[in-house]
Structure formats: structure tokens, C-alpha cells
Amino acid sequence: FNISGCSTKKLLWTYSTRSEEEFVLFCDLPEPQKSHFCHRNRLSPKQVPEHLPFMGSNDLSDVQWYQQPSNGDPLEDIRKSYPHIIQDKCTLHFLTPGVNNSGSYICRPKMIKSPYDVACCVKMILEVKPQTNASCEYSASHKQDLLLGSTGSISCPSLSCQSDAQSPAVTWYKNGKLLSVERSNRIVVDEVYDYHQGTYVCDYTQSDTVSSWTVRAVVQVRTIVGDTKLKPDILDPVEDTLEVELGKPLTISCKARFGFERVFNPVIKWYIKDSDLEWEVSVPEAKSIKSTLKDEIIERNIILEKVTQRDLRRKFVCFVQNSIGNTTQSVQLKEKRG
């Protein structure tokens, strides 16, 4: 199709070489083509900014994305050629940064429903640059945490070194929906609930004498509980003795619950005590068996190929530890009678 009629938007992605970050493009279709198939997110026409990200409607929830090769070759279907770019409805997600993402991206509705739609397309010229060392050293992260139940804020990484007084108008999106336009480099969450987690995008306009660009950054926000104040507790084994059959294989499981910690370094290991000797046993890797917002249950097993008389004189000790402290639970094996 002819892309000369597409509206054009220029975007700039300045990525940090120190961190993993993502990027998104919205199929930002212009008026009036958008109006007959995009729902308006409860805004009256007077209140709607000139461009909203395409949000899809019941009859058209999808668009087609292409990349325009720089050598003038025909348009390439994104889905076929670029595994690190994922299309989710009307949004294009770039999973890895890099200057090789620079280029022209075109989106248009999959289904052409009216003569209007023939020219209903957007060409986005994306320029991708690594952040220079001269840039702000302490820019906000592309992964930010909000503490549940408290007041929090989300900072725009590309603007976090500027004061609010210097900040341009910033357009914020959450999960592809227009959130607000603020003359501030951050948005404040009054009281954090779990629904505040998601993908936030901040846009602002940067102009030079020649043209203007939309500078965009993406922030992955997760909601978290406060760091635990408790050491881990051992859920299993509960008893300190275990009846066993001599000569038979045996697996003893140690399950421990660790409270949430932002920097999470759980330790769970088995060691054996035999009179005055004590040694750590190499056992299968620990595995997480349940993970929630507040805590994680981790299990590690000790496996005896067959229980010997010597094992009855030993103590098998499960040791668990987090940054607060440690807990142990020992098990003495006892021969089953009868």
C-alpha cells in the first residue's frame, strides 16, 4: 500500500547501557479515521487531546505493523522478521534496546472498512541512542517499585534529573491508556494498591530548529509489600523424629517460608551432625513451590539411597536464613518397629 499519505510521528528512545529496558510504540492513528473504530476512553471530544494511543474496539482490536527497510525494499511484516519485537493488540513492544531498533515503523488497521481507511496509517520514525556518559548519572530506573498501602511516585527516567520547575509537559500512559498530562517529571500515587502495577510510559516533546521529537521512556512498575522483619520459618519437618525402615531409600523434605525482601537471598541447606562432626550435604537444588506478594515457600530435599544403622545415630539438620536471621530444624531417624 502507499505510505505517502500516512501521518508521521518522530520518537526518540535514549536507552541506558546499564539496565534492561523496554520500549513501546502505540498505533497513534489520527482523527478522523480513528473515531469510527477506536473507543474514546470515556472522554468527550472537547476533552480529548489531539492524539490518543489506539485502544481498539470490539470490531477492530488489531492493527498490522510493518517496518520500512532503509534501502527502499518493500515493507516487512514485523511479526515475521523481528523476534525481539512483540505485537500486543495495537502496541508494539521492543524487548531489548539497541540502535538497530532505529527505523520507520508503520501501522494501519487490519480491516479496511471505509474509503477513509485506505490512508489510515501512521509512520513512526524511531531513533534509538545509547545514553551518553555526560547524561544524568542518577536517572530513575526503568523498573520501579511502589510500596502497597503507602504513598509512592513514579519518575520519568528520561527527565528524572530535571527539577519540576524545568520539566516540560509530560504525557503519561498506563498499560497503553492515556493517564494524564502533568507539568512534572513524576506522578504521585496517593495510596498504592495492587492495580497500580503495570507498564507506564512517559512522553515529552523536544524541539530543535529543524524538527520536534517525542522523547519516550517506559517504566515497569510493580507493587510490593515492605521488607519482612521476620526470619524464615520452617514448615516441614515439624517433628524432630522420623520413623524409617532400614535398607530403604528415604527423602526428607525441608520447606521454609521466607518473607518478602527487595533484595532476596534465601539460604536453605541440609547438614548432618554425627557426634562432634558436622558437614553440609550436597543435595538437589532448592525450588520455589509457592510465591505470593508477601512471601515465598522454598523446598529442598535430602535423599538417602538407603537408610543405614549409622544414619540412626545422626541428626539431619535443615538450616534456613534470610537477612534478618536463621532457623534450624533437626530430625533424628528412628527405626520402625514391627
Epitope: S180, V188, E191, Y193
Partner: nanobody
Framework: DVPLQESGGGLVQAGGSLRLSCAAS????????MGWFRQAPGKEREFVAT????????YYADSVKGRFTISRDNAKNTWYLQMNSLRPEDTAVYYC?????????????????WGQGTQVTVSS
């Protein structure tokens, strides 16, 4: 049934004061940010001030900073706008609004619930 109800508007001389109140009939209406906006004849609705229900964090438009104070009484589910040193250019219909998103926003279209407005007229 209007979920928000303003009161306290009226006619005042330049330099005078007024206190506007906004009562929310439903607690869920005022879960997040609570704001005041105004609309003068022939002009667009503009942001005046907003306050976070839990945090008490406030934002003001530059034109009212130092003159207007927004406050809230969570127990009464009511918030206020104390307007001092009023000027003729403050003449407008004042609307209270609530935003249940939990994010403190200054963008008028982001607010879910609106009152019917109260007229404030400042004469010179």
C-alpha cells in the same frame, strides 16, 4: 443523585475571602485525589488545586499559589478550598471533582466524578 455537592460560592469584593466545600455522598468516590477546577465564561475548564485523600499531598495552579489552600476532612468525606486575596480574574464556576484512580492528577479529564459547580464572582 449527584455524588459530589459544592457549597460556599457567592459574590465577594476583590481582596476578600471565600471557603468552598465539597461533600462526597459515597466513600468510594473520594478514594484517591480530590480536586477543584474552575471555568470562566467562554474559557476552558482549568485546574485549581488537588489533594491526595490518604497522603494529603497538594498541587496548585501557579495562578492561585499562596492565595488558595485545599484541605480535606476524611471523617466527613468532605474537602475544602479556602480562597484568600481574591481577584476579579478568579470569577468562575468552581467544580469539585474526585479521581478514583489513586493517582494525584491535575488533568481535568482524568477525574471520574464531578459536582454541578458553584458560582464565585469577584467584583472590583
Amino acid at each position: 443523585d449527584v455524588p459530589l455537592q459544592e457549597s460556599g460560592g457567592g459574590l465577594v469584593q476583590a481582596g476578600g475571602s471565600l471557603r468552598l466545600s465539597c461533600a462526597a455522598s459515597d466513600r468510594t468516590v473520594s478514594k484517591g485525589a480530590m480536586g477543584w477546577f474552575r471555568q470562566a465564561p467562554g474559557k476552558e475548564r482549568e485546574f485549581v488545586a488537588t489533594i491526595g485523600r490518604s497522603s494529603g499531598i497538594t498541587y496548585y495552579a501557579d495562578s492561585v499559589k499562596g492565595r488558595f489552600t485545599i484541605s480535606r476532612d476524611n471523617a466527613k468525606n468532605t474537602w475544602y478550598l479556602q480562597m484568600n486575596s481574591l481577584r476579579p480574574e478568579d470569577t468562575a464556576v468552581y467544580y469539585c471533582a474526585a479521581d478514583s484512580s489513586g493517582i494525584i492528577r491535575t488533568t481535568s479529564w482524568a477525574y471520574d466524578y464531578w459536582g454541578q459547580g458553584t458560582q464565585v464572582t469577584v467584583s472590583s
